[in-house]
């Protein structure tokens, strides 16, 4: 079934933009003018996943790359990564719940929580350039509090 | 205070175009996914489509190839372009914003504005 | 596309009355629907979404239940300011949200 989607960029609460950093891993930095062009656009689809009232099931694909975030198991701790799919089946509305986070709205600010692993969600650091990463705690040093930006093409 | 007002409706022939708009006071549309939803008279509600961003737009699917919805955030507004229009598209046209991106749903509306088609 | 099917049509209450009002969808929807109440010449306003969540200030004696194909809005006491028209709204389906054709709640 086609799913709805969007283009979008993110942003921590910082005001950190996400970019590339190496071909599997996302890093959050402050950006400026012409620099704003690094930040990475997503395509973010609604898909199928558990109800919950505020909880929106979302996957977070790179737009035009076979790349979607996903969350996994890595040394027995929830881990965060880009991982390749086949462009020709995805966007899907049933994605595996490894690509599917519950996206969270409240006063136009966003948080993507981790289906597969409840209570865990995307975060950045307070510190200039460091991964993007699955982090287990909410309002302590990290963030996981976002704003979204659409993308015009 | 929040709002959002619709213009630019009116009588219009059979056959031809008209293009509404939707402006929003008290917040920006700029990340506001916005809905255009119908109503003819003494009528049900139909659902027209909807943006997301500028490339991103999903329509009912008797509105693909007749109605465009697209938008300009320098001017706040969403528009709703229709062509060919037909009897059957008198109707109350309102613009609707959904709650939170991807909800489905429409917590805030405009007043709606009148589109005759009548020869 | 999905189908929504609205019963009963019109419904004629007193103040004071329950009212149930019922939406079926033609394919499960999980808990991806919405309630909407109109009043003549006025825009739609919001009651609940996700089945059962009221939206920001509707009074408690609206209800919603109900999940996959089968919903339903309660009223628990109606007032003078309930008569109006009620839109089922399917929020989930695809590319696609449709509405239901309303029940009019009427003074009986």
């Known amino acids: 079934a086609p799913v709805r989607s969007l283009n979008c960029t993110l942003r921590d609460s910082q005001q950190k933009s996400l970019v590339m950093s190496g071909p599997y891993e996302l890093k959050a930095l402050h950006l400026q003018g012409q620099d704003m062009e690094q930040q990475v656009v997503f395509s973010m689809s609604f898909v199928q996943g558990e109800e919950s009232n505020d909880k929106i099931p979302v996957a977070l694909g790179l737009k035009e790359k076979n790349l979607y975030l996903s969350c996994v198991l890595k040394d027995d701790k929830p881990t965060l990564q880009l991982e390749s799919v086949d462009p020709k089946n995805y966007p899907k509305k049933k994605m595996e719940k490894r690509f599917v986070f519950n996206k969270i709205e409240i006063n136009n600010k966003l948080e993507f929580e981790s289906a597969q692993f409840p209570n865990w969600y995307i975060s950045t650091s307070q510190a200039e350039n460091m991964p993007v990463f699955l982090g287990g705690t909410k309002g302590g040093q990290d963030i996981t509090d976002f704003t979204m930006q659409f993308v015009s093409s | 205070e929040v709002q959002l007002v619709e213009s630019g409706g009116g009588n219009v022939q059979p056959g031809g175009s008209l293009r509404l708009s939707c402006t929003a006071s008290g917040f920006s549309l700029s990340n506001s996914a916005m809905a255009w939803v119908r109503q003819a008279p003494g009528k049900g509600l139909e659902w027209v489509g909807i943006i997301y961003d500028s490339a991103s737009t999903y329509y009912a699917s008797w509105a693909k190839g007749r109605f465009t919805i697209s938008r300009d955030n320098s001017k706040n507004t969403v528009y709703l372009q229709m062509n060919s229009l037909r009897a059957e598209d008198t109707a109350t046209y309102y613009c609707a914003r959904e709650r939170a991106i991807f909800s489905g749903d429409f917590a805030l509306w405009g007043q709606g504005t009148l589109v005759t088609v009548s020869s | 596309d999905i189908v929504m099917t609205q019963s009963p049509s019109t419904l004629s209450a007193s103040v004071g009355d329950r009212v149930t009002i019922t939406c079926q969808a033609s394919?499960?929807?999980?808990?991806?629907l919405s309630w909407y109440q109109q009043k003549p010449g006025k825009a739609p306003k919001l009651l609940i979404y996700r089945a059962s969540t009221l939206a920001s200030g509707v009074p408690s004696r609206f209800s919603g239940s109900g999940s996959g194909a089968e919903f339903t809005l309660t009223i628990s006491s109606l007032q003078p300011d309930d008569f109006a028209t009620y839109y089922c709204q399917n929020t989930g389906g695809g590319i696609n949200i449709a509405f239901g054709q309303g029940t009019k709640l009427e003074i009986k």
């Open positions: 394919q499960s929807i999980s808990s991806y």
